[in-house]
């Protein structure tokens, strides 16, 4: 049985040229953590992280996309196109499957507001 | 240049263990993971598991988990294999193979090592 | 554990012609996915890595494409010494397994 929940970041904003912190959190189970993928709003892969073998940065974010704060992960030098949907997986032994949600919004305005917290999606 | 170079061929005997080396040179150990990769006679390749020097994390194929350890000395720069209870069909040429940094295919290899399971 | 199924096993083809091999793996692996030549008696060699990244220094007659389940090696010009075994790997999930081979011959 299923006992966990994943809290996201949830709706977060940040400004064009900025970076982000995307970061979920498996609460409430035991079960133990294999691998965490992140995948962006297309269903590409943006980064795996084996629990054992360390991080996994697809070639095309290697440049933009940095490993951490724990299974986390860093977007670097954010464009327009970033918009949209985040998708972290949780790969849990014996649960199965978690997933979570983040969305987020670039903006174009200098004074946009990086704003974060914490939400069960 | 990255080297990976691998101890020489074995031959033991059903029930015995072996333990083959991997030298790596030209790069920090710590910075790669290194895996260990069999291929039986014409057979396809077959991943035996990976070591993550930096963190000491390990992580086994099923079909060897408790027969395989991996283990690496980084003040000797050397990656090792240890495969017990062995039997004829572990009959095969044993690959060292890091993963590139950052990414998970496999960039570098070492020669090979025979490794020869015969009563 | 996730099934590569590698096809054809093997390939008889002329010098200059155009060979394509494919990957079918038994779950999405989104581009997990890694390409390597092998020949007799030696340690396989990166080609392919993230289903279509040519790895350094690899010619630019092989490329890769595919995404999901269904990914595609190609050698645009066959050489003489593209004579190999040809491997498909996924990395998406452990085990990491890898496809049966496809053995290129030369007509």
């Known amino acids: 049985m299923m006992t966990g929940t994943i809290e996201t970041t949830g709706n977060i904003s940040a400004k064009k040229g900025g970076s982000v912190i995307l970061q979920c959190h498996l609460s409430s189970t035991m079960a133990q953590v294999t691998q965490v993928n992140w995948e962006q709003h297309d269903h590409s892969l943006l980064a795996i992280r084996n629990a054992e073998l360390g991080w996994h940065i697809y070639p095309a974010f290697k440049d933009r996309v940095a490993p951490g704060p724990g299974l986390g992960l860093t977007l670097q030098s954010l464009t327009m196109n970033d918009t949209g949907e985040y998708f972290c997986t949780y790969h849990t032994y014996p649960d199965g499957t978690y997933r979570g949600r983040i969305f987020l919004e670039v903006l174009e305005s200098s004074v946009a507001e990086h704003s974060a917290r914490f939400q069960i999606p | 240049q990255v080297q990976l170079v691998q101890s020489g061929a074995e031959v033991k005997k059903p029930g015995a263990s072996v333990k083959v080396s991997c030298k790596a040179s030209g790069y920090t150990i710590t910075e790669n993971t290194m895996h260990w990769v069999r291929q039986a006679p014409g057979q396809r390749l077959e991943w035996i598991g990976g070591?993550?020097?930096?963190?000491?994390?390990?992580s086994y194929s099923q079909k060897f988990q408790g027969r395989a350890t991996l283990t690496v000395d980084t003040s000797a720069s050397t990656a090792y294999m240890e495969l017990s209870s062995l039997r004829s069909e572990d009959t095969a040429v044993y690959y060292c193979?890091?993963?590139?940094?950052?990414?998970?295919?496999?960039?570098?290899w070492g020669q090979g090592t025979t490794v020869t399971v015969s009563s | 554990d996730i099934q590569m199924t590698q096809s054809p096993s093997s390939l008889s083809a002329s010098v200059g012609d155009r060979v394509t091999i494919t990957c079918q793996a038994s779950?999405?692996?989104?581009?997990?996915l890694a390409w390597y030549q092998q020949k007799p008696g030696k340690a396989p060699k990166l080609l392919i890595y993230s289903a279509s990244y040519r790895y350094t220094g690899v010619p630019s007659r092989f490329s890769g494409s595919g995404s999901g389940t269904d990914f595609t090696f190609t050698i645009s010009s066959l050489q003489p010494e593209d004579i190999a075994t040809y491997y498909c790997h996924q990395h998406y999930t452990t085990p990491w397994t890898f496809g049966g081979g496809t053995k290129l011959e030369i007509k």
């Open positions: 779950q999405d692996i989104k581009t997990a």
């Open positions: 070591i993550n020097p930096n963190q000491g994390g390990t």
């Open positions: 193979t890091r993963s590139s940094y950052y990414r998970y295919d496999l960039d570098y």
